[in-house]
C-alpha cells in the first residue's frame, strides 16, 4: 500500500538498517526510496527538546511485515518509502537549505557570486554530491562568498549542523542539469586499474554500468564476464573512482569490460531498470519466498509485486510436474544485487521491475516499428500529438511531443493569432485524424509558454510549451519521448525520423494518417550554405536529402524530429521552417532541442 504523507511526532520502533543525515524529512523519504532495502524511516527535526547531535538524522528501516510499531516522540517525523507506490519517482532535489551546514569532505573551495552559481558548479563537477555556500552576510570575512564542494561515500552528509548565514544544497545531476559528458560506450577487453570503492555481483556489463550510475561514488567500472579466467572473480562488478574523474590506466585484458557512470545522461537512459532475463543463470541471495509460477515472466511479475523482492531465480517445471508450473524463488540482499551468480544449473534469473519507476518513463521500449512505407502504424510514435484549434473551425493546427505528463513541446510559430489557450485541444494516441470526433477525449491547454526571445521561426527560438489542464496517463499509445542529454551534444544521430499529418507537397491538405520519413541530419555548415540569406545558428539543426524528396511540410510544424540512440528515442528537433517542402538542396530546419533543455526544465519544473 502506498502511503505518501508524513507522520508528525511519530517514531517507528526497531527495524534499523542504517542512519544517514538529511536536511529534511522529505529528502529522508527519497533516500529511503532509493536504498535497496529501506521501507520505512524516522527523521528527527531540529527541536529544543532534542539533543542537537540527533537533529537531521534519518534512520532507514526495514520490516518483514512492511510496517513497525509507532511511538509518540516530539520532533520525530516518520513515513514510508515510495517503493510501495506506482507513481514516477525522482531523486532531483532543487531545495536550498538556509542556515544549514551539510558536512562532508570539502575537496574544492572557490569564490562564487551566489548560491545558484555554487550549485551549478557542484552539478558540473564529477565528484560533487552537495555544497555549502557562505553568504555575503557570513561573519568571517575571508569565508564570505566561498563555495565548498563536498562528497561522501554515501552521497549524503556525514552530519548536518545549524550555521548562520550559510546555505546548502545538492548537486542537480539527477535533475538532468549537468553539462558533464555522457559517455555511453562500453569498452571490451579493458580493465580500468583505479581504486575500487565497492564491488557487487552482476550478470552483465550493462547491469554493472547501471549499478555504477546510481552508486554515489562510482565514476566508472570494470566488469569480469563469466568467461573471466579467475573463477572467484567471474560476474564481479568493480565500482571505481579516481581523483581526476577519469581512469588513470587502461589495461588490455580479455573477457573484461569497462565503462563509465551514466550519471549525466540518466534522465534519458534506464539506470534502475534491469529488465532482461538471464538464462541458465542462478542468482543467490536471501530467500524471501518460494512460489509456483507458470513462466519466468510470471515469476518476474511476482517479484515486482512483492515490495521486498529485489531479484529472482525461476526453475522451470520438470516434465508434467505441478501442473506445468515451475518454482519461483524471490530473493533479496543487503545491496540489491545477488551475493553470487552461478551458471549451468538451468535457472532463469532477473530483477524486480519495481525500480523502473525511478527511471524516466521516456526510456521505456516501444513496440518495434514498421520499416519502409510512409504511413505510420498505431503506437509507433506514442509521443506525437495533434494540436487542434477550434477557430474558425476545429482542425489540426500543429504537431507536438509529449515530454511529461502535463507537458507538450511544440513550435512557437504555431501560436500566431491564437489569443487564448482555451481554444486549443490536444489529442494523443491518434493515428488517423478521422478518429477525432466530437466526443473524442482531449486535453485542454492551461497555458502556452512561448520562448521570450522568439520573434519568427527563421530567426530561431521557435519553441513553446503547452501546459495541459489534466495529466496524461501513460499507455502504449501515449507516452513521453526523452529530451536529449546536454552531455550528448557531440552524439552523431543516424536514425532520425520526422512525423506529422502535414502536407505531402506544397499545395496539398492535412493528411488523414500520421506520416513518417527517415531523414539524415545535415551539418550546420552544410545547412548554412543552402540558406545564404539566413543565419543558421547552433540553436537550429537541419535535416534533409541533398536531392530533396522527403521533408516536413505545412502542418508538420511543432512535431518531432525523433532520433533513436542506444535503443532510446530522443526529441532532437522540433519542426520549424524551410524553403518550400522537400526541395533539392533545401533541408528542413528544426529547433535544436538540446540547446533548450535548461529552458524546458526551468519552465516545467517551476514551482
Amino acid at each position: 500500500e502506498c502511503v505518501t504523507q508524513l507522520l508528525k511526532d511519530t517514531c517507528f520502533e526497531g527495524g534499523d538498517i542504517t542512519t544517514v543525515f538529511t536536511p529534511s524529512a522529505k529528502y529522508c523519504q527519497v533516500v529511503c526510496t532509493y536504498h535497496p532495502r529501506c521501507l520505512l524511516f524516522t527523521f528527527t527535526a531540529e527541536s529544543p527538546s532534542e539533543d542537537p547531535t540527533r537533529w537531521f538524522t534519518c534512520v532507514l528501516k526495514d520490516s518483514v511485515t512492511e510496517t513497525l510499531p509507532r511511538v509518540n516522540r516530539t520532533a520525530a517525523i516518520s513515513g514510508y518509502s515510495f517503493k510501495q507506490c506506482s507513481h514516477q519517482i525522482s531523486a532531483c532535489n532543487k531545495d536550498i537549505y538556509v542556515d544549514l551546514d551539510m558536512k562532508g569532505i570539502n575537496y574544492n573551495s572557490s569564490v562564487a557570486k551566489s548560491a545558484q552559481e555554487c550549485q551549478e558548479r557542484c552539478t558540473d563537477d564529477v565528484h560533487c554530491h552537495f555544497f555549502t555556500y557562505a553568504t555575503r552576510q557570513f561573519p568571517s570575512l575571508e569565508h564570505r562568498n566561498i563555495c565548498l564542494l563536498k562528497h561522501t561515500q554515501t552521497g549524503t552528509p556525514t552530519r548536518i549542523t545549524k550555521l548562520d548565514k550559510v546555505v546548502s544544497g545538492f548537486s542537480l545531476k539527477s535533475c538532468a542539469l549537468s553539462n558533464l559528458a555522457c559517455i555511453r560506450d562500453i569498452f571490451p577487453n579493458t580493465v580500468f586499474a583505479d581504486s575500487n570503492i565497492d564491488s557487487v555481483m552482476a550478470p552483465d556489463a550493462f547491469v554493472c554500468g547501471r549499478i555504477c550510475t546510481h552508486h554515489p561514488g562510482c565514476l566508472f567500472f570494470t566488469f569480469f564476464s563469466q568467461e573471466w579466467p579467475k573463477e572467484s572473480q567471474r560476474n564481479l562488478c568493480l565500482l571505481k573512482t579516481s581523483e581526476s574523474g577519469l581512469p588513470s590506466t587502461r589495461i588490455k585484458k580479455s573477457k573484461a569490460l569497462s565503462g563509465f557512470s551514466l550519471q549525466s545522461c540518466r534522465h534519458s537512459i534506464p539506470v534502475f531498470c534491469h529488465s532482461s532475463f538471464y538464462h541458465d543463470t542462478d542468482f543467490l541471495g536471501e530467500e524471501l519466498d518460494i512460489v509456483a509460477a507458470k513462466s519466468h515472466e510470471a515469476c518476474q511479475k511476482l517479484c515486482t509485486n512483492a515490495v521486498r523482492c529485489q531479484f529472482f531465480t525461476y526453475t522451470p517445471a520438470q516434465a508434467s510436474c505441478n501442473e506445468g508450473k515451475g518454482k519461483c524463488y524471490l530473493k533479496l540482499s543487503s545491496n540489491g544485487s545477488p551475493t553470487k551468480i552461478l551458471h549451468g544449473r538451468g535457472g532463469i534469473s532477473g530483477y524486480t521491475l519495481r525500480l523502473c519507476k525511478m527511471d524516466n518513463e521516456c526510456t521505456t521500449k516501444i513496440k518495434p516499428r514498421i520499416v519502409g512505407g510512409t504511413a505510420s502504424v498505431r503506437g509507433e510514435w506514442p509521443w506525437q500529438v495533434t494540436l487542434h484549434t477550434t477557430s474558425p473551425t476545429q482542425r489540426h493546427l500543429c504537431g507536438g511531443s509529449i515530454i511529461g505528463n502535463q507537458w507538450i513541446l511544440t513550435a512557437a510559430h504555431c501560436f500566431y493569432g491564437v489569443e487564448s489557450p482555451k481554444i486549443l485541444r490536444v489529442y494523443s494516441g491518434i493515428l488517423n485524424q478521422s478518429e477525432i470526433k466530437e466526443d473524442t477525449s482531449f486535453f485542454g491547454v492551461q497555458e502556452i509558454i512561448i520562448h521570450d526571445q522568439y520573434k519568427m521561426a527563421e530567426s530561431g527560438y521557435d519553441i513553446a510549451l503547452l501546459k495541459l489542464e489534466t495529466t496524461v496517463n501513460y499507455t502504449d499509445s501515449q507516452r513521453p519521448i526523452c529530451l536529449p542529454s546536454k552531455g550528448d551534444r557531440n552524439v552523431i544521430y543516424t536514425d532520425c525520423w520526422v512525423t506529422g499529418w502535414g502536407y505531402r507537397k506544397l499545395r496539398d491538405k492535412i493528411q488523414n494518417t500520421l506520416q513518417k520519413a527517415k531523414i539524415p541530419l545535415v551539418t550546420n555548415e552544410e545547412c548554412q550554405k543552402r540558406y545564404r540569406g539566413h543565419k543558421i545558428t547552433h540553436k537550429m539543426i537541419c535535416a534533409g536529402y541533398r536531392e530533396g524528396g522527403k521533408d516536413a511540410c505545412k502542418g508538420d510544424s511543432g512535431g518531432p524530429l525523433s532520433c533513436k540512440h542506444n535503443e532510446v528515442w530522443h526529441l532532437v528537433g522540433i519542426t520549424s521552417w524551410g524553403e518550400g517542402c522537400a526541395q533539392r538542396e533545401r533541408p528542413g530546419v528544426y529547433t535544436n532541442v538540446v540547446e533548450y533543455v535548461d529552458w524546458i526544465l526551468e519552465k516545467t519544473q517551476a514551482v
Epitope: S391, P421, I423, K437
Partner: antibody
Framework: QVQLQQPGSELVRPGASVKLSCKAS????????MHWVKQRHGQGLEWIGN????????NYDEKFRTKATLTADTSSSTAYMHLSSLTSEDSAVYYC??????????WGQGTSVTVSS | NIVMTQSPKSMSMSVGERVTLSCKAS??????VSWFQHKPEQSPKLLIY???NRYTGVPDRFTGSGSATDFTLTISSVQAEDLADYHC?????????FGAGTKLELK
C-alpha cells in the same frame, strides 16, 4: 438536445442601440464558439463575428467591428450581441449559431430587428 | 476576404430531377466548405460540412463534392420539400463568408 433560443423581434429607433440575446442549452456552452449571422430581406447571409465563451476571445468581420459587440455570460449560458447607432441598414434577421465540430450545426430561430422611427 | 460565388442564382426544377449547384471560392479553402438549406420563416439547416460529409439526418440524395476552389452540391432526385435557398459558406479563414445563395424553385 441542443437549443439556441432567441427573441422573435425587436423594434428600435434610429440612432439607438439594442442587445440581442441567445440562450444556449443541451451542451457545454463554454466549449463552443458562438457565431452571429445577419440576413437582410431577400439577400444572402453575412457573418458578423464569433465569441468563445470560455475565454471571451472574439473575432469580427471588419465591416461590423464598430457596429457589433459580442459578449457571453457563462453563468446563464447566454450569448449577447450589442448593436449600436442603428440605421435602416441594420434592419435584418440576426441568427446566433453554434460552431460545432466542423460547421455551424445549430441555429437559433433568429431575431428580426426593425429600425424605424 | 475570400469571396464565395454561387451559381446559378436560381433554378426551376421538376420533382425527381437531378440538381447540381456550384460554389466557387476566390482562393484555396481546402475542404472547409459547408452547405446550408434555408426555407422561408425558418433558420438555416446544415446539410454538408467539410465539402463532402453529410450531416446527421440529412437524406442521402444530398451529396457534396470538391476541394480547393470548386465545390458542388448535388441533389440526385429533387423532392418538393427541397425547395429552398441553398448557401455555401467557407470556414477556412476569417472573416467567414457565404455565397449569395441559389434559389431552388418548382417548375
Amino acid at each position: 438536445q441542443v437549443q439556441l433560443q432567441q427573441p422573435g423581434s425587436e423594434l428600435v429607433r434610429p440612432g439607438a442601440s439594442v442587445k440581442l440575446s441567445c440562450k444556449a442549452s443541451g451542451y457545454t456552452f463554454t466549449r463552443y464558439w458562438m457565431h452571429w449571422v445577419k440576413q437582410r430581406h431577400g439577400q444572402g447571409l453575412e457573418w458578423i463575428g464569433n465569441i468563445y465563451p470560455d475565454s471571451d476571445s472574439t473575432n469580427y468581420d471588419e465591416k461590423f467591428r464598430t457596429k457589433a459587440t459580442l459578449t457571453a455570460d457563462t453563468s446563464s449560458s447566454t450569448a449577447y450581441m450589442h448593436l449600436s447607432s442603428l440605421t435602416s441598414e441594420d434592419s435584418a434577421v440576426y441568427y446566433c449559431t453554434r460552431m460545432g465540430f466542423y460547421a455551424m450545426d445549430y441555429w437559433g430561430q433568429g431575431t428580426s430587428v426593425t429600425v424605424s422611427s | 476576404n475570400i469571396v464565395m460565388t454561387q451559381s446559378p442564382k436560381s433554378m426551376s426544377m421538376s420533382v425527381g430531377e437531378r440538381v447540381t449547384l456550384s460554389c466557387k471560392a476566390s482562393e484555396n479553402v481546402v475542404t472547409y466548405v459547408s452547405w446550408f438549406q434555408h426555407k422561408p420563416e425558418q433558420s438555416p439547416k446544415l446539410l454538408i460540412y467539410g465539402a463532402s460529409n453529410r450531416y446527421t439526418g440529412v437524406p442521402d440524395r444530398f451529396t457534396g463534392s470538391g476541394s480547393a476552389t470548386d465545390f458542388t452540391l448535388t441533389i440526385s432526385s429533387v423532392q418538393a420539400e427541397d425547395l429552398a435557398d441553398y448557401h455555401c459558406g467557407q470556414s477556412y479563414s476569417y472573416p467567414l463568408t457565404f455565397g449569395a445563395g441559389t434559389k431552388l424553385e418548382l417548375k
